[in-house]
Structures are given as structure tokens and as C-alpha cells.
């Protein structure tokens, strides 16, 4: 039940051993009690004991004190449990009976007689405090106390609030006297089922399943889950957001696995060679003469450099070489001659000059011959003097270059410009390319040579009135009307009533100049726009520190690093090129990204919304101006948009809008 009415019998006095009918008990009144508890009645009536009833065994004879007994037969206080909301009022009937029969179950014995009875009616609040009372009549006296208490797990003024203390998966609490939950230390929530995480545990990046714990969501680490984990493939880098790979000093590459100081760290170059931090392996060795190999580890033949002169033959020795000189020469390299001009040592018409008072000589060679004795024929083509694939030809004392089509000059160094003959019509800009000239056409024209006027011409509809001349503007939708004498307005629609003495020539000249000026400004703007839109190929720069670039061709926004203000960002969306976007002449400032890219605002379990920033966040870029249009960079898994602010250095009128 929800509560218990408890009645403690304390003392019964029946000194004369009399029954209610005036007779006396023989040999004495063997007394037991019947208790009936019912709803409040102003006048107690017979009928069912609606709140319960109980009987005692024989507790004594005539007069006796009733001791407390917690178990077994003759339990005191008496318990009357109920399983309803306690109403706060009651009627109680206590009857004392004499039995001649069985002591243990006297209520069933025949011949029982009433000794006395008392009726109590009134109100009684639930509580632990006993209410004590004493009832007398002419023959008997009964001392007793009573109270109403709630059963285990029931609380409140009427024992109507159920609360069972627990410490399990469904809750961790004790019960307050009023039945409300009191969470055990470390737990919170309506049902005390939410643990209080370690103090300082990051609200988004961490969670806990028991008190004082801090479990990190994917990509985060540390006691408070406020430190990121670098990318899986990262080797010598750190992160400021999960899965990033920002290289430590001296390291480069996508996963920071290229040693930018390989020479210092590993000293790979042998035999005194010079090491430079470049090349496919991160280093290059420049060997000293006499050494070769990737690390200059291989010693060349000492004779490989042809040290012997004047026809001397070279012989390798263990650590050096030896020159065997032909007759007439001596010295380590056969560099000294024993001949003189008298021996006619100069060949091919060389003239001999005596040196050192006639003890040696020097030959002065005619063109096309060289060597100390003019014995070698000069090949003027050995230095590959002809550029751009020109063929070198020895022609007597000189050489000539035979140039490929499109090139000229002594060394074929001059490119014959295809643009020299101005092949581009309608003011198109000409670019010399290997396969011929390419024209960049102004607005309103197309074709290889800008010879085709785009049919969607603003002037085609004849927007100018009164015989005005129409000129197409910068874009196909723009036009300018050059008004004839006597008309004004953007379409020359308004006639002007002018006095006879009006200075027509001056006005016509003024209007003409204004129109020319407008057209000139438009052309300048157009040329500038074209130049702005052209990718700046010379200043391409390698993107370092890119992290996980594979996930569905999404750009991990915070991982883009581009310090080149004119860099164009191209996105390859695999086979489906319709998903590709190109950003030109816009700077994506890496340092702005963490602050600008918000967390996904999706409800539900943490990872769905917390794949933040450096992870696989799709970039959606749109522009509000046609000339700033940027194709969406998209993917089948685009489920969450993030905002990126793109700020143009050069075109302030282009405002890039973003979706979140």
C-alpha cells in the first residue's frame, strides 16, 4: 500500500473484570482487541471497515500493560495498511473482548463477549509523531497512541507520491521527504540520469557517461577535449582544428613529410660535395670534380677529366694519374714543350711566336683552328647556339642558324609575332600561342578572330529614336544613343525647342565629345575587366598543408592556404564536371576561416553536427553579381552548408554572398 495507519496499545485497565453487559468474567477477562478503521463519519455506523480492520491475540487478563512487539503474533503497534491517497480524516473503533477459548485466534472462538469499545473520529495528517490518547468509561480505561506514515517509497502529505531511490542506468537519486528526487553527487537532470562531466570539459567537443569524466568526440583529445588531433596521414605537423596538418618548421608537403632541411638533418652528400634542399627527394648533391653518383659517392677515373695536354696519354694510379708525354713535351700535364719555332710546330697555317728568349713558343691559329699547335678544327656548333630548335651549320670561318618557321634572328631567338598583322577584329586582344594567334573578344563579339557579332545585340531592337545612331555598350544588354541635332534623352526621345541664335556647332561638338568620352571610358573598363579575369599564370603558388582533400571533392575550407592574392582556385569534381567551380582573383584568407566557418546547426547526436571546419565541410559559394558568378562546389553528400567570406583585393564591387 501507499501508507500505514499504526495503532500502539499501551495499557488496558479493567480492575473488576467486568463485561459490558454487567457480568463478570470467570476466572478473569481474557482480553483481546478488534480494531476497525473507516472513512470519516460524523456518526459511527456499523458496516464495512473501509480503511481496514485487524484483531489481536489475547494480550492479558483484566488489567495489563501492552509491550511493543515487532514480529509474530501479538505485534504492537498494530498495522493497518492502505493503498490509496490518505484523505486526512478517519473513524476508528477499538473494541475490547473477552474470550473463553484459544489464545492465538480468539476472534474465531465461540462465546466471546464485549468488554468495552471506544470510537475516535477526526483528522490526522501523515507524520512520524504519535498522537497519544486515553479513553475511560465506568468500568475500563484504555491508553493508546496512533499515527499515519507512508509506506516505503511513498511520500507527500497523502502518501500519493511514489519515489524509489536508485543508482543505475535509469537514474541516480535519493528521495526528499516530499517525494522529490535528490540527485546523488555528480548527477543532474530531471531524473538524475545526466552525469556532470569533468569541470571544464568542452561543451561541444566532449561528453561523459559518468561523473567527472570527459570523453572526446572524434577529432579531439586531452583532459578537457580542447586539443585537436592532426590528420591520420600527418607526419611532422600539428593542427588548430581536427584532422588538419599544419607543418612544423622545416617540413612541407601535404602530410608534412618532406624535409625542407634534409641537408642539415641527414648530410647525404659525400666527398665534400655541396648539398641543396631541392629536388624530388628533398635534396640534390653537386659533386666536386672526380666524383659522381646521387650522393657523389662514386669516384670517377682520375683520367676522366683529360688532364694530359699536347697529345699526352693518361694512366690511372691509386690516388692520382700520370701523363705519358709525346716527344717534344714534358711536365705533369705535358704542358711544357721542348720544341722551338725552328721546329715548325704550328699546323694548319698557324704562325709561331717565340717565348722565353726562344726556349719555348706559342702558335697563333687561323680561324676554324685551335689547340696549342693549331691541330684541332673548331666546331662552332658544339655550344648549341641556335635557340627555338634552330639547326646549326658550320660555314667556313663562321656558323649559321637555320630557323624553324615562326622564328628569326642570328640565333633564331626572335619570335615572328602572329599578332603583328592584327588578326583580331572589333578591337579583340591578340595572344601569341604556339599553335597560332588567339583572340580575346570584347563584349558583343565572338569567333576565332572576333569577326562574328553576337546576334543578341541591344541595338538590334532599334532603341534609339529620331534617327539617332545606336552603339553597343560593354555588355550585350547595354547601348548608347548618339542623338541628332534637336533631340536629347537616353534614347533621343525628347525634342528640344531652340532659339534661332543657338550655337549648334558648339553643342554638337560638346555632345560628340561626351559620347566619345563615355565610349572611351567603357573601352578602358572593358580592357581592365578582361585583364582582371585572366588567370595570373606566372604567380601560381603551391598549396601547402592541405589535409584530407579526397572526401567527395569537398574543399576542407579551413585547410586551404593561399597567400597569393591573384591565385585562382580550381576544383576538380571528378568526372562530373558540372559540379566544378573556379575562383578567380579572390583571396581566401586562411586565418579568417576558423572564425567565419560556423558549426553545422543540425540537431541530434554530436558527430552529425560536429564534423566541423577542418573536416569535410562543403563550401558553397555564390555571387550576387553576374560578373562575379562562382559555380557551386558540390557533392552528393552536401548536407550542411558553411559560410566563407571571400574578399576581393581588386574588385570591391563584387560582393560574394554565402549560404549557411
Amino acid at each position: 500500500g501507499s501508507g500505514i495507519f499504526q495503532l500502539r496499545l499501551q495499557e488496558f485497565v479493567n480492575q473488576r473484570g467486568m463485561l459490558a453487559n454487567g457480568q463478570s468474567c470467570e476466572p478473569g477477562c481474557r482480553t483481546f482487541f478488534r480494531i476497525c478503521l473507516k472513512h470519516f463519519q460524523a456518526t459511527f455506523s456499523e458496516g464495512p471497515c473501509t480503511f481496514g480492520n485487524v484483531s489481536t491475540p489475547v494480550l492479558g487478563t483484566n488489567s495489563f500493560v501492552v509491550r511493543d512487539k515487532n514480529s509474530g503474533s501479538g505485534r504492537n503497534p498494530l498495522q493497518l495498511p492502505f493503498n490509496f491517497t490518505w484523505p486526512g480524516t478517519f473513524s476508528l473503533n477499538i473494541q475490547a473482548w473477552h474470550t473463553p477459548g484459544d489464545d492465538l485466534r480468539p476472534e474465531t472462538s465461540p462465546g466471546n463477549s464485549l468488554i468495552s469499545q471506544i470510537i475516535i473520529q477526526g483528522s490526522l495528517a501523515v507524520g512520524k509523531i504519535w498522537r497519544t490518547d486515553e479513553q475511560n468509561d465506568t468500568l475500563t480505561r484504555l491508553s493508546y497512541s496512533y499515527r499515519v506514515i507512508c509506506s516505503d517509497n511513498y511520500y507527500g502529505e497523502s502518501c500519493s507520491r511514489l519515489c524509489k531511490k536508485r543508482d543505475d542506468h535509469f537514474g541516480h537519486y535519493e528521495c526528499q521527504p516530499d517525494g522529490s528526487l535528490s540527485c546523488l553527487p555528480g548527477w543532474t537532470g530531471k531524473y538524475c540520469d545526466q552525469p556532470i562531466c569533468l569541470s571544464g570539459c568542452h561543451e561541444q567537443n566532449g561528453y561523459c557517461s559518468k561523473p567527472d569524466e570527459c570523453i572526446c568526440r572524434p577529432g579531439w583529445q586531452g583532459r578537457l577535449c580542447n586539443e585537436c588531433i592532426p590528420h591520420n596521414g600527418c607526419r611532422h605537423g600539428t593542427c588548430s582544428i581536427p584532422w588538419q596538418c599544419a607543418c612544423d618548421e622545416g617540413w612541407g608537403g601535404l602530410f608534412c613529410d618532406q624535409d625542407l632541411n634534409y641537408c642539415t638533418h641527414h648530410s647525404p652528400c659525400k666527398n665534400g660535395s655541396t648539398c641543396s634542399n631541392s629536388g624530388p627527394k628533398g635534396y640534390t648533391c653537386t659533386c666536386l670534380p672526380g666524383y659522381t653518383g646521387e650522393h657523389c659517392e662514386l669516384g670517377l677515373s682520375k683520367c676522366a677529366s683529360n688532364p694530359c695536354r699536347n697529345g699526352g696519354s693518361c694512366k690511372d694510379q691509386e690516388n692520382s694519374y700520370h701523363c705519358l708525354c709525346p716527344p717534344g713535351y714534358y711536365g705533369q700535364h705535358c704542358e711544357h714543350s721542348t720544341l722551338t719555332c725552328a721546329d715548325s710546330p704550328c699546323f694548319n697555317g698557324g704562325s709561331c711566336r717565340e717565348r722565353n728568349q726562344g726556349s719555348s713558343y706559342a702558335c697563333e691559329c687561323p680561324p676554324n683552328f685551335t689547340g696549342s699547335n693549331c691541330e684541332k678544327k673548331v666546331d662552332r656548333c658544339t655550344s648549341n647556339p641556335c635557340a627555338n630548335g634552330g639547326q646549326c651549320q658550320n660555314r667556313g670561318p663562321s656558323r649559321t642558324c637555320r630557323c624553324r618557321p615562326g622564328f628569326t634572328g642570328t640565333h633564331c631567338e626572335l619570335h615572328i609575332s602572329d599578332c603583328a598583322r592584327s588578326p583580331c577584329a572589333h578591337g579583340g586582344t591578340c595572344h601569341d600561342l604556339e599553335n597560332g594567334p588567339v583572340c580575346t573578344c570584347p563584349a558583343g563579339f565572338s569567333g576565332r578572330r572576333c569577326e562574328v557579332r553576337i546576334t543578341h545585340d541591344a541595338c538590334a531592337s532599334g532603341p534609339c529614336f529620331n534617327g539617332a545612331t545606336c552603339y553597343t555598350g560593354l555588355s550585350p544588354n547595354n547601348f548608347v544613343c548618339n542623338c541628332p541635332y534637336g533631340f536629347v534623352g537616353s534614347r533621343c526621345e525628347f525634342p528640344v525647342g531652340l532659339p534661332p541664335s543657338f550655337p549648334w556647332v558648339a553643342v554638337s561638338l560638346g555632345v560628340g565629345l561626351v559620347v566619345l568620352l563615355v565610349l572611351l571610358v567603357m573601352v578602358v573598363v572593358a580592357v581592365r575587366q578582361l585583364r582582371l579575369r585572366r588567370p595570373d599564370d606566372e604567380s601560381r603558388e603551391a598549396m601547402n598543408n592541405l589535409s584530407d582533400f579526397q572526401k567527395d571533392n569537398l574543399i576542407p575550407a579551413a585547410q586551404l592556404k593561399n597567400t597569393n592574392q591573384k591565385k585562382e582556385l580550381e576544383v576538380d569534381c571528378g568526372l562530373d564536371k558540372s559540379n566544378c567551380g573556379k575562383l578567380q582573383n579572390h583571396t581566401l584568407d586562411y586565418n579568417l576561416a576558423p572564425g567565419l566557418l560556423g558549426r553545422g546547426g543540425m540537431p541530434g547526436k554530436y558527430p552529425h553536427s560536429d564534423k566541423s571546419l577542418g573536416e569535410k565541410v562543403p563550401l558553397r559559394l555564390h555571387s550576387e553579381k553576374p560578373e562575379c558568378r562562382i559555380s557551386a562546389i558540390c557533392s552528393p553528400r552536401d548536407s550542411m552548408y558553411q559560410s566563407v567570406c571571400l574578399i576581393s583585393e581588386e574588385r570591391n564591387e563584387c560582393v560574394i554572398a554565402t549560404e549557411v
Partner: antibody, heavy 118, light 107 residues
Framework: EVQLVESGGGLVQPGGSLRLSCAAS????????MAWVRQAPGKGLEWVAT????????YYRDSVKGRFTISRDNAKNSLYLQMNSLRAEDTAVYYC???????????WGQGTLVTVSS | DIQMTQSPSSLSASVGDRVTITCRAS??????LAWYQQKPGKAPKLLIF???DLADGVPSRFSGSGSGTDFTLTISSLQPEDFATYYC?????????FGQGTKLEIK
């Protein structure tokens, strides 16, 4: 090239202790969280413990809590697992791995066998 | 703890075959799932992380898909070196847990 080399395994009696070491190279050890993962003979893989790179915070599977201690020495590029009060069910090949409990284990050592038997 | 169940526990296939291994999580783990390959007497090797991202140096014949509770590893054309045991692992919930493994044998 990333390399993780475990050592310290061997035969030990129940209740005994063992200390495993893992020498790391080919990456900046101090930048990355590390873990121990074990595999009982003929069985599957089981995560044992993790230590963060940032502040050395440690986590353990329930069955080894209070008996095993994971630690690291960034100056020596080394990871350790101190195993006390060993039980027969701790018998396994112990792998040192780079990763946390909430990230993939990107690199693994060759493993060291720990046999707990009387 | 999250239970990871792989199926089949073993399978036989021939070189050139297309093979699919599945992994089921007892709770939604989003895309926080990895696949590993282990050859006898060797350490496991990371193949795929975040459900579908290939680890560095892994051939493109390996691919992964799924999200939530159901995931698959596919080998488009089996090569002799692919015969091994494959494990899935979730790292969405603490503690991380592995599947029991799928042994891929030569038919």
C-alpha cells in the same frame, strides 16, 4: 617512413608484472596521441589504452583499469605500458599504434607477445 | 559498448573477383568507421577511415561506403596480396570497438 617498434614482451606468471616499450620514428612523436591495442591468439583486436599528446591524459578499457598504466616520454620518442597483476586473459600480442580512442589507428608496430601462464 | 558485427566471418574468392564485406554497428556511429587489413603474423594496416576515405598508399580497388549502422568494404578486383583478415572499427563512441574479423581465403 613511420616506424613503431615494440619490445618488452615475454612469459610471466599470473600476478606478475611486465613493462612494454614502443620506440617511434618517422614522425613528430610529441604531436600525436598514442595507443596500445592487443590481440589474443586466434582472436580479434581489442583496444587497451590511449594517451593524449597534448597533456598526457590517459584512458583504459574497464578490464585493465587499475592494473595497467600507459605513459610516454616525448624526449625519447617512446611509449610505455606498465602491466601489473597480470591474468591469463591478458595473454596477447600487444601492438603500439598511433591514434586515440576516437580516431583511426593510422600506424601500427609489429607487436610484442605477452604470455601469462603458470 | 557498441557492438560491431561483421559478415561473413569467412569467405572464399578467386583472383579478379569482386568482394564485399559488411559491418553492422549496434548504434548509429555516423561515418566514424575504419577498415583494417591483417595478414598472418603481421600488424593490422589501415585501409579506409571515415567510412570511405582511402588511407595513404592503399590501392583504389578498395572502397568503403555506408553511414549510421550499416557499412561495406568492397574490393573491386581481388589481387593475390588481398587474401587476409579484414576488421572494421568504430571510433564514434567510447570505448572504440572492433568487429570480429572476416577471413578472406583463396577459393
Amino acid at each position: 617512413e613511420v616506424q613503431l617498434v615494440e619490445s618488452g614482451g615475454g612469459l610471466v606468471q599470473p600476478g606478475g608484472s611486465l613493462r612494454l616499450s614502443c620506440a617511434a620514428s618517422g614522425f613528430t612523436f610529441s604531436n600525436f596521441p598514442m595507443a596500445w591495442v592487443r590481440q589474443a591468439p586466434g582472436k580479434g583486436l581489442e583496444w587497451v589504452a590511449t594517451i593524449s599528446s597534448s597533456d598526457g591524459t590517459t584512458y583504459y578499457r574497464d578490464s585493465v583499469k587499475g592494473r595497467f598504466t600507459i605513459s610516454r616520454d616525448n624526449a625519447k620518442n617512446s611509449l610505455y605500458l606498465q602491466m601489473n597483476s597480470l591474468r591469463a586473459e591478458d595473454t596477447a600480442v600487444y601492438y603500439c599504434a598511433r591514434g586515440y580512442y576516437n580516431s583511426p589507428f593510422a600506424y601500427w608496430g609489429q607487436g610484442t607477445l605477452v604470455t601469462v601462464s603458470s | 559498448d557498441i557492438q560491431m558485427t561483421q559478415s561473413p566471418s569467412s569467405l572464399s574468392a578467386s583472383v579478379g573477383d569482386r568482394v564485399t564485406i559488411t559491418c553492422r554497428a549496434s548504434q548509429d556511429i555516423y561515418i566514424n568507421l575504419a577498415w583494417y587489413q591483417q595478414k598472418p603474423g603481421k600488424a593490422p594496416k589501415l585501409l579506409i577511415f571515415d567510412t570511405s576515405d582511402l588511407a595513404d598508399g592503399v590501392p583504389s580497388r578498395f572502397s568503403g561506403s555506408g553511414s549510421g549502422t550499416d557499412f561495406t568494404l568492397t574490393i573491386s578486383s581481388l589481387q593475390p596480396e588481398d587474401f587476409a583478415t579484414y576488421y572494421c572499427q568504430q571510433y564514434d563512441y567510447y570505448p572504440p570497438t572492433f568487429g570480429q574479423g572476416t577471413k578472406l581465403e583463396i577459393k
